[in-house]
């Protein structure tokens, strides 16, 4: 029961995490204009992995896609790649873990196969979460570096009279969504790996023991107590616990993306 709960919870946590990773990847607020030096700006800039946006005094928001691949910074490309790899691995992990769930019966799939699949999906979730955390962290580091660089030469004199403030960017909401989502996916993956161990306990071999009774020479060879590890076939004396085939409809809710007006 505890194993089923751990596996189910791991699946749900990972599902939420991957939904969050997808949401973060699609969000436009990876970096937002730092308002510390210009709190009264009527033009608010923010940027995502795929496009940059400007919200004007009218409330109108205009977004422009990055219609170039070669012209983009290598770091941005790397972040994109990490997030996409994280999503792909997470999606495959979800697919595998659905079939691995103990509460769902598919044909005559053995516990050994389910344990294997649980471990596989768990590893995929862990790698997916790490990819997301790495991607977000690389972007955050890039922001911090650029922030201090732009602070160093923030005011560029124009004819010695007029000062123009260079736009600085700080952490956007997507970074926090990405970190939390990556963490959840990672935790979900760890839970799946723990559940796998529960599905596949250590193999125990009971050696035959001879009992010598007076007047009789009888040898008892207890059989059918070889514990299934989930990795070897154990067709004899295998008890199938079937609590009834349950189909649990998972409600999947992806955070929606908003242009804040």
């Amino acid at each position: 029961m505890a194993v089923t709960a751990c596996q189910g919870l791991g699946f749900v946590v990972s599902l939420i995490g991957i939904a969050g990773i997808i949401a973060a990847t699609c969000m436009d607020q990876w970096s937002t204009q730092d308002l510390y030096n210009n709190p009264v700006t009527a033009v608010f800039n923010y940027q995502g992995l795929w496009r940059s946006c400007v919200r004007e005094s009218s409330g109108f928001t205009e977004c422009r896609g990055y219609f170039t691949l070669l012209g983009l910074p290598a770091m941005l490309q790397a972040v994109r790649a990490l997030m996409i790899v994280g999503i792909v691995l997470g999606a495959i992990g979800l697919l595998v873990s659905i079939f691995a769930l103990k509460c769902i019966r598919i044909g005559s799939m053995e516990d050994s196969a389910k344990a294997n699949m649980t471990l596989t999906s768990g590893i995929m979730f862990i790698v997916s979460g790490l990819c997301a955390i790495a991607g977000v962290s690389v972007f955050a580091n890039m922001l911090v570096t650029n922030f201090w660089m732009s602070t160093a030469n923030m005011y560029t004199g124009m004819g010695g009279m007029v000062q123009t403030v260079q736009t600085r960017y700080t952490f956007g909401a997507a970074l926090f969504v990405g970190w939390v989502a990556g963490g959840l996916t990672l935790i979900g993956g760890v839970m799946m790996c723990i559940a796998c161990r529960g599905l596949a306990p250590e193999e125990t071999n009971y050696k035959a023991v001879s009992y010598h009774a007076s007047g009789h020479s009888v040898a008892y060879k207890p059989g059918g107590f070889k514990a299934s590890t989930g990795f070897g076939s154990n067709t004899k004396n295998k008890k199938i616990y079937d609590g009834g085939a349950r189909t649990e409809d998972e409600v999947q809710s992806y955070p929606s993306k908003h242009d804040y007006v």
Epitope: V43, S52, V54, G59
Partner: antibody, heavy 115, light 113 residues
């Protein structure tokens, strides 16, 4: 087509309050900010502030902040500008404006403050 | 606050001639996020609300005749009417659309010589 229709002219005594309405039509009311602009007789334009009907957010010109209240009612697509503690120099035409680059303006509401 | 200074205060130009109105801001209106200048030009005729001509310093609003053009960047901007028509007689205002409070120039009264 986009239209902003303002309430009629008002005559008020000093110290009183006035509430001017601006009814919007032809666009999604919650998508754009509604700005208010003052124009005293024979004078230039002066921005008073804006209300964002989508989230209720607002921004005021500090010159008017303590006396102006901007509100909106999304159910009837109407924005309001209330000016309190009226003085004689508040006599002016008040416009509401919206759209990109203030593309759309109300016809203006003349508020006369006279004792 | 950003101060908008328009020049001249009034201008008389012959029909068919070019009219040029200048606007200077005390701070740059250039937004590095999208490489645009946030300056607006309006035309106002007596008893009417202002009419949008140009936004983002050089983008003509829909329905505005192409004889109206805006140029400039940073702190110096210009509105040009290439060939003055009788219906262009009005007061023209520039506006800072970059920083709150949004501020307007004092206006330039355009008349026919």
């Amino acid at each position: 087509q986009v239209q902003l229709v303002q309430s009629g002219a008002e005559v008020k005594k000093p110290g009183a309050s006035v509430k001017v309405s601006c009814k919007a039509s032809g666009f999604t009311f919650t998508s754009y900010n509604i700005h208010w602009v003052k124009q005293a007789p024979g004078q230039g334009l002066e921005w008073m502030g804006y209300i964002s009907p989508g989230n209720g957010g607002s921004n005021y010109n500090l010159k008017f902040k303590d006396r102006v209240t901007l509100t909106s009612d999304t159910s009837i697509s109407t924005a309001y500008m209330e000016l309190s503690r009226l003085r004689s120099d508040d006599t002016a035409v008040y416009f509401c404006a919206t759209g990109r680059g203030f593309a759309y303006w109300g016809q203006g509401t003349l508020v006369t403050v006279s004792s | 606050d950003i101060v908008m200074t328009q020049s001249p205060d009034s201008l008389a130009v012959s029909l068919g001639e070019r009219a040029t109105i200048n606007c200077k801001s005390s701070q740059s209106l250039f937004n590095s996020g999208n490489q645009k200048n946030y300056l607006i030009w309006y035309q106002q005729k007596p008893g009417q609300p202002p009419k949008l001509l140009i936004y983002r310093a050089s983008t003509r609003d829909s329905g505005v005749p192409d004889r109206f053009s805006g140029s400039g960047s940073g702190t110096d901007f210009t509105l040009t009417i290439s060939s003055l028509q009788a219906e262009d007689v009005a007061v023209y205002y520039c506006q800072n659309d970059y920083s709150y409070p949004l501020t307007f120039g004092g206006g330039t009264k355009l008349e026919i010589k």
